[in-house]
């Protein structure tokens, strides 16, 4: 699920997640990540794949939390 631009609020431009992927992304395909703006209606972690795709994920998902800890360390 790609991120979507939101023009609402003073933080334009930014990206917000409105839906999350259902599936765990293979770890080796992920290059980077960032958190969406705190003013978005839903929290989100966006993973950037090695092919340049942006994938919205749920910060509550355990795999997302595990991957972030792994990436912070590495």
């Amino acid at each position: 699920t790609k991120t979507e631009s939101s023009s609402r609020g003073p933080y334009h431009p930014s990206e917000c997640c409105f839906t999350y992927t259902t599936y765990k992304i293979p770890r080796q395909r992920i290059m980077d990540y960032y958190e969406t703006n705190s003013q978005c209606s839903k929290p989100g972690i966006v993973f950037i794949t090695k092919r340049g795709h942006s994938v919205c994920t749920n910060p509550s998902d355990k795999w997302v939390q595990d991957y972030i800890k792994d990436m912070k360390e590495n």
Partner: antibody
Framework: CQSLEESGGDLVKPGAFLTLTCTAS????????YMWWVRQAPGKGLEWIA?????????TYYASWAKGRFTISKTSSTTVTLQMTRLTAADTAIYFC??????????????WGQGTLVTVSS | DVVMTQTPASVSEPVGGTVTIKCQAS??????LAWYQQKPGQPPKLLIY???TLASGVPSRFSGSGSGTEYTLTINDLECADAATYYC????????????FGGGTEVVVK
């Protein structure tokens, strides 16, 4: 060639403590892997016990019935252990370790060990 | 927790026949389903993942289908070597991390 091997299975008395070890050959655990312990009582189906993330956090997850009595740990980049306490006859089973290698969006166990037998009897 | 209900518990078919095994999840599992074959004294062997993707080296006589809560494993042109117990499995790493196996189906080849 990648493989998993379980060890530590034994005949023990009720109330005993036992540690099982799962050793990986041909690969080391990474942020792609989740390692699982699954057991199978004689003539019965498969039942999961615990799971550990192969990456830095080493996060652990347990079946609700296993919390407090079973402990999964990553003791090196190629070994995972399962500590079992207060064993009862109901814990008699073959214990398997398995890997979810995380190579696709669809999770599955792509590698299993041959299993180690734990028998609890007085 | 998600419960996987597998039917039938046992099935007997002749060589060359077809076997169909069903697995029903207690909620939508979004095709996060795998099928395994287990023979006595051996660990389970992966057959299918993602509900329909054949694992490497598995004959095309095996096929999987389904979505939502209903999934099926079909074995065509049954061979003696297919005599085994088959399990479905759901895995999630979402708000909970868990896996749930079906109760198993024993396939007897006559």
């Amino acid at each position: 060639c990648q493989s998993l091997e379980e060890s530590g299975g034994d005949l023990v008395k009720p109330g005993a403590f036992l540690t099982l070890t799962c050793t990986a050959s041909g690969f080391s655990f990474s942020g792609s892997d989740y390692m699982w312990w699954v057991r199978q009582a004689p003539g019965k189906g498969l039942e999961w016990i615990a799971c550990i993330y192969g990456g830095y956090s080493g996060s652990t997850y347990y079946a609700s019935w296993a919390k407090g009595r079973f402990t999964i740990s990553k003791t090196s980049s190629t070994t995972v252990t399962l500590q079992m306490t207060r064993l009862t006859a109901a814990d008699t089973a073959i214990y398997f370790c398995a890997r979810d290698g995380g190579v696709t969006h669809f999770s599955h166990f792509d590698l299993w060990g041959q299993g180690t037998l734990v028998t609890v009897s007085s | 927790d998600v419960v996987m209900t597998q039917t039938p518990a046992s099935v007997s078919e002749p060589v060359g026949g077809t076997v169909t095994i069903k697995c029903q999840a207690s909620e939508d599992i979004y095709r996060l389903l795998a099928w395994y074959q287990q023979k006595p004294g051996q660990p389970p062997k992966l057959l299918i993942y993602g509900a329909s993707t054949l694992a490497s080296g598995v004959p095309s006589r095996f096929s999987g289908s389904g979505s939502g809560t209903e999934y099926t494993l079909t074995i065509n042109d049954l061979e003696c070597a297919d005599a085994a117990t088959y399990y479905c499995q759901y895995i999630t790493y979402g708000s909970d991390v868990l896996t749930a196996f079906g109760g198993g189906t024993e396939v007897v080849v006559k």
